[in-house]
Amino acid sequence: LVVTPPGPELVLNVSSTFVLTCSGSAPVVWERMSQEPPQEMAKAQDGTFSSVLTLTNLTGLDTGEYFCTHNDSRGLETDERKRLYIFVPDPTVGFLPNDAEELFIFLTEITEITIPCRVTDPQLVVTLHEKKGDVALPVPYDHQRGFSGIFEDRSYICKTTIGDREVDSDAYYVYRLQVSSINVSVNAVQTVVRQGENITLMCIVIGNEVVNFEWTYPRKESGRLVEPVTDFLLDMPYHIRSILHIPSAELEDSGTYTCNVTESVNDHQDEKAINITVVESGYVRLLGEVGTLQFAELHRSRTLQVVFEAYPPPTVLWFKDNRTLGDSSAGEIALSTRNVSETRYVSELTLVRVKVAEAGHYTMRAFHEDAEVQLSFQLQINVPVRVLELSESHPDSGEQTVRCRGRGMPQPNIIWSACRDLKRCPRELPPTLLGNSSEEESQLETNVTYWEEEQEFEVVSTLRLQHVDRPLSVRCTLRNAVGQDTQEVIVVPHSLPF
């Protein structure tokens, strides 16, 4: 089949006339909306068949699909058909009219469907909304077909703007009919309860109108009956719920609760189970280890995290040096406790741009009327090392000394090194480490002081050089867990003038 113009999509002007031609090796016919519009059919001398469809005085209502197919069923590739889609942008036509049955979309399984709201102009922006909502739904739109996706049982409308007026389509109603497969879900208000509290479970079955619920529960083993209540969720068609309520739970009520749902028409069934734990009294339990010594780096933010399990929900307090902490208005401290599962919690203390004063003894206490737990640790603020001073002196004894002073937390290590060949060292040759070597060319004396108020160590190290016969680059490197700092000084022999 050959169609001219070939399409597959044409945009034609309103009020214009347009000619479509289809030709093939057997009789052909144009179809529009399952009908054959008036057309001229002919047979050429070469045996080719054709059909000419003349569209006159086009309006927006001529927008749609046009098919050319073989006109007989003599086995000449009868399934071959050519499709052409024509748009006739027409500001007087909003959405193309639908048959009544197109407004009601019924389905029996979860499958993709199309809401067939179509416009005459492929340039228009069309959005889909729930009938009672303004928010556009994120569903892909095809100007030739409409919105396709998986839809809930709701009412939908399409909207577009033509010129400066907003146009709404008719409402489309999506109905999911009763289906025979059973999908059961079971959930509990709480899966952990204290004895004396209530257990409430819900079993919901979707997609069937008539079902039978059967619960099995630990209490039944003892012949203690629980009467479930069945109701219909009115806002959700074919959602039937069975509620199992046990007042004043006992320890023996711990165990597996199973909801079995049967549907007698097709004899389908499904069951789901959930575990319930009844505890004698509430509990708070730490999960995982938190070291008794924690570190934070000066001026960096640090979050300290404690994970624990508790039931019922606990109160969580943080203390520093036995004083209660709260979220500070200056934003220096943030406290948060998140419920990450029914009984699991994560409590976090965040120190923003840590200061030296925030070092100290921290405690987290989680408690309720039945139990409590606390966790303590020492927070050490780590301060990167700084070399504060590197100086050289010539005592009368003839030796030369270099003094290096620096600070940091934790305690810095000091490394002395020297370059004798100033041209090549340290780029080409490694520096020589200095220290209390056996050759006694150099001697080292190091003193360490802890400054309580600043909560850091000060290191003072003096390097004594016995005889310096040529210029020497002496380097002092301080290093600790959070950084290092280096300074160097040129030491010249006594005899050399500066």
Epitope: K220, E221, S222, G223, L225, P247, S248
Partner: antibody, heavy 116, light 107 residues
Framework: EVQLVESGGGLVQPGSSLKLSCLAS????????MYWIRQAPKKGLEWIAL????????YYADSVKGRFTISRDNSKNTLYLEMNSLRSEDTAMYYC?????????WGQGTLVTVSS | DIQMTQSPPSLSASLGDKVTINCQAG??????IAWYQQEPGKVPRLLIR???KLESDTPSRFSGSGSGRDYSFSISNVESEDIASYYC?????????FGGGTKLELK
């Protein structure tokens, strides 16, 4: 200690009425479903009625349905069995029971004799 | 109603014998069966629940088994204090129903 004490039994004529009571103690009465069971002389056991803890649901054996009514007063820790249109085959020892470990707690029973 | 057919109605045993009582339910009762002992002039006493779970005061010579519709109750080593009537009870479906009872006597 769980105790169930039945009362109200006696000799009545066929067609007449009787109301049995069962006073419960030693447990939280309002948390438990309660039952009546009977045993005819030299015969077996027959379950006759059940009432749920909250007074909402009641079940009966076919043999007593429409004639007997089970009820409870949780504020008085008391279970009742109102028996109307009594027949000779209702002659039995009537036991009140608490639902745990099916029928693990029994009262001593009260004897109902229906005879002309 | 679920019919419970208990057999035999009576049983003679010598001390030290093993005896077995059977109960057949009219339908699957999913192991929800209990066994009671009733001595003459006394109230029934629960021995076993949920097919095979012995009550805390039930001697270990008593046992229960079964599934679906067929259940049995055994005394492995009959003692004189075991002379009584025994009843099965299905408590899967309301109305709960008892078996007709088995009277155990000494030979």
């Amino acid at each position: 200690e769980v105790q169930l004490v039945e009362s109200g039994g006696g000799l009545v004529q066929p067609g007449s009425s009787l109301k049995l009571s069962c006073l419960a103690s030693g447990f939280t009465f309002s948390n438990y479903n309660m039952y009546w069971i009977r045993q005819a002389p030299k015969k077996g056991l027959e379950w006759i009625a059940l009432i749920f803890y909250d007074n909402n649901n009641k079940y009966y054996a076919d043999s007593v349905k429409g004639r007997f009514t089970i009820s409870r007063d949780n504020s008085k820790n008391t279970l009742y069995l109102e028996m109307n249109s009594l027949r000779s085959e209702d002659t039995a020892m009537y036991y009140c029971l608490r639902d745990s470990g099916p029928f693990s707690y029994w009262g001593q029973g009260t004897l109902v004799t229906v005879s002309s | 109603d679920i019919q419970m057919t208990q057999s035999p109605p009576s049983l003679s045993a010598s001390l030290g014998d093993k005896v077995t009582i059977n109960c057949q339910a009219g339908q699957n009762i999913k192991k929800y069966i209990a066994w009671y002992q009733q001595e003459p002039g006394k109230v029934p006493r629960l021995l076993i629940r949920y097919t095979s779970k012995l009550e805390s005061d039930t001697p270990s010579r008593f046992s229960g088994s079964g599934s679906g519709r067929d259940y049995s109750f055994s005394i492995s080593n009959v003692e004189s204090e075991d002379i009584a009537s025994y009843y099965c009870l299905q408590y899967d479906n309301l109305p709960w129903t008892f078996g007709g009872g088995t009277k155990l006597e000494l030979k």
